[in-house]
């Protein structure tokens, strides 16, 4: 049996040493103690006796089915108990009682049906992350299972097989400031929203099956709900579902942001608010986030016509790895106030984005992402683009375009390109020289010689430059990230004539360390300033006796130099 | 959805690896949960894994969580289930199955695979 290694802070590490019990000789000098992946079974109640300043105790996955009532008795500052998946059929409250300063409790993927017979946390006054429950057997939560909990951070509730909620269970927690409930169905969830209403600030719904969701008016009085974020992970909706879950939004007058993350909608988007209120109560929402939402008939999708005007004081949209081909003419002008559209990872073309992008679509927009689609002509999607007056950064980054042609039009405020990734290999002036950021990062060019008046900041790493760029073609640089090229030296000149750089990422390059190279680099402490990675990414890659070895640390041979 | 054809199971000694398959027949594949369960000698069927439709969701017994892993092809219509560090504690009859909840709970699956056999020897 292998034993703890321990820090000189008390940080014991017993991971997966095969264990059979808790290790004799722990002391009080321990201040954390992780035992997960062993085959521990059996907490005695002289097990942790010794442990009196532990702060930190993590027993995952350590197969522990019994735990004395006293055994962490001693344990007075522990703050971080994670007792995670493992084989507890049963809590016990009397495990809790002497924990008073515990922060942070893992209780989850243990097989318990319940939290137990009588309160489990009464004396944890100063808890602030609990999580609880399983996937197989937690089946019911009762009002006194979180009684003494006043606020909590983070609560998580893995409640996969529930088949009873006493109402009111979670009303008694005043201020939930994250709640993730995982819950495989529906019946609950509007008795559960009664009961949380007024205390969380981010509710997150996960894995739940929302297709047979219906909405009825929650008993509660007129309620101001702090409700900023509402999150549906892995969920599966309808249209039919979809427009009773938008009913909840008039109790929830705060929200701001919505996410659909991994959902599916087994719809065809043919929604219809039929309450005209919703569409007045989503006027606080200014961001929505659906990422990859699975739509089985996603070639028969309607043209959401009907919730334009759900949509239109909402700032911020990302719909990302979803098949969009298409925002329709008239979806995108009735986006008024729209200032940030990300729709990463889809299927737009250049056909498509041109009815997209229409006269008078997305009047606000500043930001526009369109990574990793498939758009090919970067001519077409900058004369498309000309429509939106006030965008000033678009990223077309990780689309594979054909070679750049000597001149484009751009709309005239941008300031910020992304082309990483776009396979280029020579930079023309289809770029334009308003710019003030282009990233140019992992393509295929060999040189960079375009005068950008503006800029301040290029990002072109992992190309294949074997000099840094000549300095007067940007004036105003501050920012330079030239990592992974093929650079093989720099010198006090060339650093000099950029009059304003403040930063320089260019490591991991092949330098030849001459004579000329390492005597700037040991004469310029201040290089340390400039060259934010440095010294440990810049090595010699020849001569061959000094390959991998530091700049900063490699010595020129007397010989070599003075010749 | 039909659950058609398991394999991969046998004979193995403690301490090595199986990798079970399920494959469903029709095209609704991606629109179920998938779950696997097993059954010893004499004992009640228990969950062991369970993953969502798309695959961006799992979660495991904590009998078998770090040992196994849970996995799908929706394009092949086949749901896997790799199991490491096997102990003679793990011998059972392993079932597929499909259903609309994401859950650990037997009763909620409505399409079940015939079984594959798993027997580790010590």
């Known amino acids: 049996q292998e034993s703890l290694s321990c820090d000189a802070s008390g940080v014991c590490d017993g991971r997966s040493r095969s264990f059979t019990s808790i290790p004799s000789g722990l002391t009080a000098a321990m201040k954390s103690l992780d035992l997960s992946f062993n085959k521990i079974t059996y907490i005695g109640h002289g097990d942790l006796r010794a442990c009196a300043n532990l702060q930190v105790l993590i027993l995952k996955s350590s197969r522990i089915n019994t735990i004395e009532g006293d055994a962490f008795y001693s344990l007075g500052s522990l703050e971080h108990l994670d007792l995670s998946d493992n084989h507890l059929s049963s809590l016990s409250s009397s495990w809790f009682g002497p924990l008073s300063s515990l922060k942070y409790l893992n209780l989850m993927g243990n097989p318990y049906q319940t939290l137990g017979v009588t309160s489990l946390f009464p004396n944890l006054t100063n808890l602030q992350t609990l999580r609880i429950g399983n996937v197989e057997t937690f089946s019911e939560i009762r009002r006194i299972d979180f009684a003494g909990l006043t606020s909590l951070n983070e609560l998580e509730i893995k409640a996969l097989s529930l088949r009873n909620y006493q109402s009111q269970s979670l009303k008694s927690i005043r201020d939930i400031h994250h709640l993730t409930l995982h819950l495989s169905e529906s019946a609950f969830l509007l008795e559960i929203f009664a009961d949380i209403l007024s205390s969380v600030r981010y509710l997150e719904l996960r894995d739940t099956n929302l297709a047979r969701f219906q909405f009825s008016p929650l008993p509660v009085d007129e309620v101001s709900s702090p409700m900023k974020k509402l999150a549906f992970r892995g969920s599966v909706l309808t249209d039919e579902s979809f427009n009773e879950l938008l009913k909840l939004l008039r109790y929830i007058l705060e929200l701001s942001e919505v996410e659909f993350d991994d959902c599916t909608l087994n719809g065809l988007g043919d929604f219809n608010p039929s309450e005209s209120d919703v569409v007045s109560e989503l006027g606080k929402v200014e961001t929505v986030t659906i990422r990859r939402l699975h739509i089985p008939q996603f070639y028969l999708f309607y043209d959401l016509s009907t919730v334009y005007s759900l949509l239109e004081k909402v700032k911020r949209i990302t719909v990302e790895n979803s098949k969009v081909f298409l925002v329709p003419c008239s979806f995108s002008q009735h986006l008024k106030s729209l200032e940030f559209l990300d729709l990463s990872e889809n299927l737009m073309v250049e056909e498509y984005l041109k009815n997209s992008a229409c006269k008078g679509a997305w009047p606000s927009l500043q930001t526009l992402v369109l990574s990793q689609n498939h758009l090919r002509s970067m001519q077409k999607t900058g004369e498309i683009l000309l429509t939106l007056k006030n965008l000033t950064s678009l990223d077309i980054s990780r689309n594979t375009f054909h070679p750049m042609p000597d001149s484009c039009q751009w709309p005239e405020k941008m300031r910020f390109l992304n082309l990483s990734s776009t396979g280029i290999r020579v930079v023309k002036t289809c770029i334009p020289q308003t710019l003030e950021v282009l990233d140019v990062s992992n393509n295929n060019l060999d040189s960079f010689s375009l005068f950008l008046p503006r800029l301040q900041e290029l990002y072109i790493s992992r190309n294949k430059l074997k000099t840094l760029p000549d300095a007067s073609l940007f004036p105003v640089l501050l920012v330079m990230k030239i990592r992974e090229n093929a650079v093989s030296t720099f010198s006090k000149d060339q650093l000099g004539s950029f009059p304003k750089l403040e930063t320089l990422e260019a490591g991991d390059n092949h330098f030849v360390c001459s004579c000329e190279l390492l005597s700037f680099t040991m004469e310029t402490p201040a290089l340390a300033q400039i060259l934010v990675d440095w010294p440990d990414s810049y090595l010699c890659d020849s001569p061959p006796r000094l390959h991998g070895h530091r700049l900063q640390d490699a010595r020129p041979s007397v010989l070599e130099c003075h010749q | 959805v039909q659950l058609v054809k398991s394999g991969g199971g046998g004979l193995v000694q403690a301490g090595g690896s199986l990798r079970l398959s399920c494959a469903a027949s029709g095209r609704t594949f991606s629109r179920y949960v998938m779950g696997w369960f097993r059954q010893a000698p004499g004992k009640e069927r228990e969950f062991v894994a369970v993953i969502n439709r798309s695959g961006g969701s799992t979660d495991y017994a904590a009998s078998v969580k770090g040992r196994f892993t849970i996995a799908r092809d929706n394009a092949k219509n086949t749901v896997y289930l790799e199991m490491t560090s096997l102990e003679p504690e793990d011998t059972a009859v392993y079932y597929c199955?499909?259903?609309?909840?994401?859950?650990?709970?037997?009763?909620?699956?409505?399409?079940w695979g015939q079984g594959t056999p798993v027997t580790v020897s010590s």
């Open positions: 199955a499909a259903g609309e909840y994401y859950t650990g709970s037997s009763s909620r699956y409505d399409h």
